[in-house]
Amino acid sequence: EVEKTACPSGKKAREIDESLIFYKKWELEACVDAALLATQMDRVNAIPFTYEQLDVLKHKLDELYPQGYPESVIQHLGYLFLKMSPEDIRKWNVTSLETLKALLEVNKGHEMSPQVATLIDRFVKGRGQLDKDTLDTLTAFYPGYLCSLSPEELSSVPPSSIWAVRPQDLDTCDPRQLDVLYPKARLAFQNMNGSEYFVKIQSFLGGAPTEDLKALSQQNVSMDLATFMKLRTDAVLPLTVAEVQKLLGPHVEGLKAEERHRPVRDWILRQRQDDLDTLGLGLQGGIPNGYLVLDLSMQEALS
């Protein structure tokens, strides 16, 4: 806390300008009116205040707005935003996308801080859902943002917002997240033709069920191995050798390089060796010829 001391004669600030950088902490506290500061927040960024001086300015705003800053002040916080704690930010009501962008710009190039995470959380909760414009903005600043959300939070993403998602935005998503996003993507892209549809849906296929993979295998999509390796193992296992061959097209030869990685390894174990041999890739580990395959899951369903 800065002690309350009277402002020396002639030092009362009439506006926020460069002369204030020469003020000591106690002079800033005594001579800068909080209301003036609030109305001229946009000027603070252009003045090279020290961190200690910024602490004083923050203290003045905290006193003026104990219940939380108004959006008109928040939008112009600039580098003062870096002084805010998550507790400060929880008091805010940020509704403007422009305000959000302005504050994200301050933190640009850095990891998502607890302050930014709290700000985004407040903003999204205030909007009720993650709309396309918000998602566009957040993924532009933080490509991994989408994958930082829980499946429950992702369920509030409307299918229309999926158009804003780029492949790199999904790089760090796990299967549970893709399980939520895939049906939304399928709905969002449903009116596209075959090849265009595949280009858009490809990044989401880690959440696709077997029947959708079977359908894709009939469309000459030529899925690459990087995409195939991200598919759910339980979705890949029921595919036949012929279906995988159609799904991968010319990329089928890549199965050899990945034969010990999931899901390829588990899929190989489910295929007849003579079916695998038809690929001519030297894949080993299939069911030997002459062995009977019992589908126990089917047996359980019948009993």
Partner: antibody, heavy 119, light 108 residues
């Protein structure tokens, strides 16, 4: 420009562990496996294993099974190779090498990390 | 595991001469799964040829590869000063992946 940058040289005592990092840049990290290959002084190349950065799935050469652990951090596009219970014959240059998923050849290599095991 | 034996261990030639390097596998290797690397002293290996005969990006046309089954060859049609190095063959047809012991091409 595609680059694999490895951590610096290490000197370890027998029985200790070493963890080497390999930071990737200039390409889509999850489209390529990362393999580790070592080379003892004046010797040839020896494949140790690989990791799929997308799934975290690993395959290890049986020779190193139980001693080697490969991990990834997608947020920093970095892979790690940890080798435990070090012995003098583990003295070598350790390379990370990029391998496009679905191929078996290494098109980009790290600069190598020298690990010396000596009492 | 498949053992790759490279011969000769050392090849002494002059610039402009033709170099023929052999790689013999202990059991059959599918030709798509064999590649060659070049390594110079103090440097990392560099991919030269993949799938037995495909030239990697940026590799001059004087390098070529051939072979099938258990016998593979790397040929350098006319040696340049920068070609003097160690060459390794590598297979990923069978687990674990293995490299040959290397052939050193040195200046005569």
């Amino acid at each position: 420009e595609v680059q694999l940058v490895q951590s610096g040289a290490e000197v370890k005592k027998p029985g200790a562990s070493v963890k080497v990092s390999c930071k990737a840049s200039g390409y889509t990290f999850t489209d390529y496996n990362m393999d580790w290959v070592r080379q003892a002084p004046g010797q040839g190349l020896e494949w140790m294993g690989d990791i799929n950065p997308s799934t975290g799935g690993t395959i290890y050469n049986q020779k190193f099974q139980g001693r080697v652990t490969m991990t990834e951090d997608k947020s920093t596009s970095t892979v790690y190779m940890e080798l435990s219970s070090l012995r003098s014959e583990d003295t070598a240059v350790y390379y990370c090498a990029r391998r496009r998923i679905g191929t078996g050849y290494f098109d980009v290599w790290g600069q190598g990390t020298t690990v010396t095991v000596s009492s | 595991e498949i053992v790759l034996t490279q011969s000769p261990a050392t090849l002494s030639l002059s610039p402009g001469e033709r170099a023929t390097l052999s790689c013999s596998a202990s059991s059959s290797v599918i030709s798509s799964y064999l590649s060659w690397y070049q390594q110079k002293p103090g440097q990392s290996p560099r991919l030269l040829i993949y799938r037995t005969s495909n030239l990697a990006s940026g590799i001059p046309a004087r390098f070529s590869g051939s072979g099938s089954g258990t016998d593979y060859t790397l040929t350098i049609s006319s040696l340049e000063p920068e070609d003097f190095a160690v060459y390794y063959c590598h297979q990923w047809s069978s687990f674990p992946y293995t490299f040959g012991g290397g052939t050193k091409v040195e200046i005569k």
